[in-house]
């Protein structure tokens, strides 16, 4: 939800002023605390799955 | 609306500890990066610490790392600072705000402030 | 990031010029200038160095790159008269300046 336009980095990137570029934010789960990972929003819940055929 | 509502400021000995806490509405909290600023009297504006959406990814100012620690609860609309072994410089009207963080960097969102003081 | 000059004394209608200026060259999309008056809360003016946030009156204005980033008033108005702080996102760290007063002259 952040305001539309503003983020050239596709769903699940972020941008890295330090670097100057998009990074993957799950590149964060090993360096959490690199610059873009600010920018990386918590993943949206994972869609329901029946639990039968 | 989008709103910050802050609780948790008061007075404390030097050597507590405090937490604040800062109630989120009005928006998708898990879809914006939090920080806390502080302000201390008379002075101007210090960046204390951030979170990313997740929470996975928290950040410090020099001067209160190890001590301070920012969290929050995302199913609950919350964010919180922890302050342990505080000192009278951390003395300071203490924001919460909502972080504009995916390549334009901004606090486009303020809470209330709520007043800290370390005193014996 | 220092902010010059500490403080401006003019007088409405005037142009205020304020100067925010970085040890290093910093990513424009970073930089951030705000307002605050006297027992308010901080309101975010600009961001990305020159985009006006939502409901920010078009006689603020900010520009630059590099090292040196500027905010200007064109034209003054009394409630324009205020403390104004830029601030910069890297190195995994946000940092204000010290700030700008405004004040009527």
């Known amino acids: 939800e952040q305001a539309p336009g503003t983020a050239p980095c596709s769903r699940g990137s972020s941008w890295s002023a330090d670097l100057d570029k998009c990074m993957d934010c799950a590149s964060c789960r090993a360096r959490p605390h690199s610059d873009f990972c600010l920018g990386c929003a918590a993943a949206p819940p994972a869609p329901f799955r029946l639990l039968w055929p | 609306q989008v709103q910050l509502v802050q609780s948790g400021g008061g007075l404390v000995k030097p050597g507590g500890s405090l937490r604040l806490s800062c109630a989120a509405s009005?928006?998708?909290?898990?879809?914006?990066?939090m920080s806390w600023v502080r302000q201390a009297p008379g002075k101007g504006l210090e960046w204390v610490s951030a979170?990313?959406?997740?929470?996975?990814?928290?950040y410090y100012a020099d001067s209160v790392k190890g001590r301070f620690t920012i969290s929050r609860d995302n199913p609950k609309n919350t964010l919180y600072l922890q302050m342990n072994s505080l000192r009278a410089e951390d003395t300071a009207v203490y924001y919460c705000?909502?972080?504009?963080?995916?390549?334009?960097?901004?606090?486009?969102?303020w809470g209330q402030g709520t007043l800290v003081t370390v005193s014996s | 990031l220092t902010q010059s000059p500490g403080t401006l004394s003019l007088s409405p209608g005037e142009r205020a010029t304020l100067s925010c200026r970085a040890s290093?060259?910093?990513?424009?999309?970073?930089l951030a200038w705000y307002q605050q008056k006297p027992g308010q809360t901080p309101r975010l003016l600009i961001y990305?160095?020159?985009s006006r946030a939502t409901g920010i009156p078009d006689r603020f204005s900010g520009s630059g790159s590099g090292a040196d980033f500027t905010l200007t008033i064109s034209r003054l108005e009394p409630e324009d008269f205020a403390v104004y702080y830029c601030?910069?996102?890297?190195?995994?760290?946000?940092?204000f300046g010290g700030g700008t007063k405004v004040e009527i002259k």
């Open positions: 990305g160095a020159s």
């Open positions: 705000a909502r972080v504009r963080a995916n390549y334009y960097y901004g606090m486009d969102v």
């Open positions: 601030q910069q996102y890297g190195s995994s760290r946000l940092t």
């Open positions: 009005g928006f998708t909290f898990t879809s914006y990066a």
């Open positions: 979170i990313s959406g997740s929470g996975g990814s928290t």
């Open positions: 290093q060259s910093v990513s424009s999309s970073t």
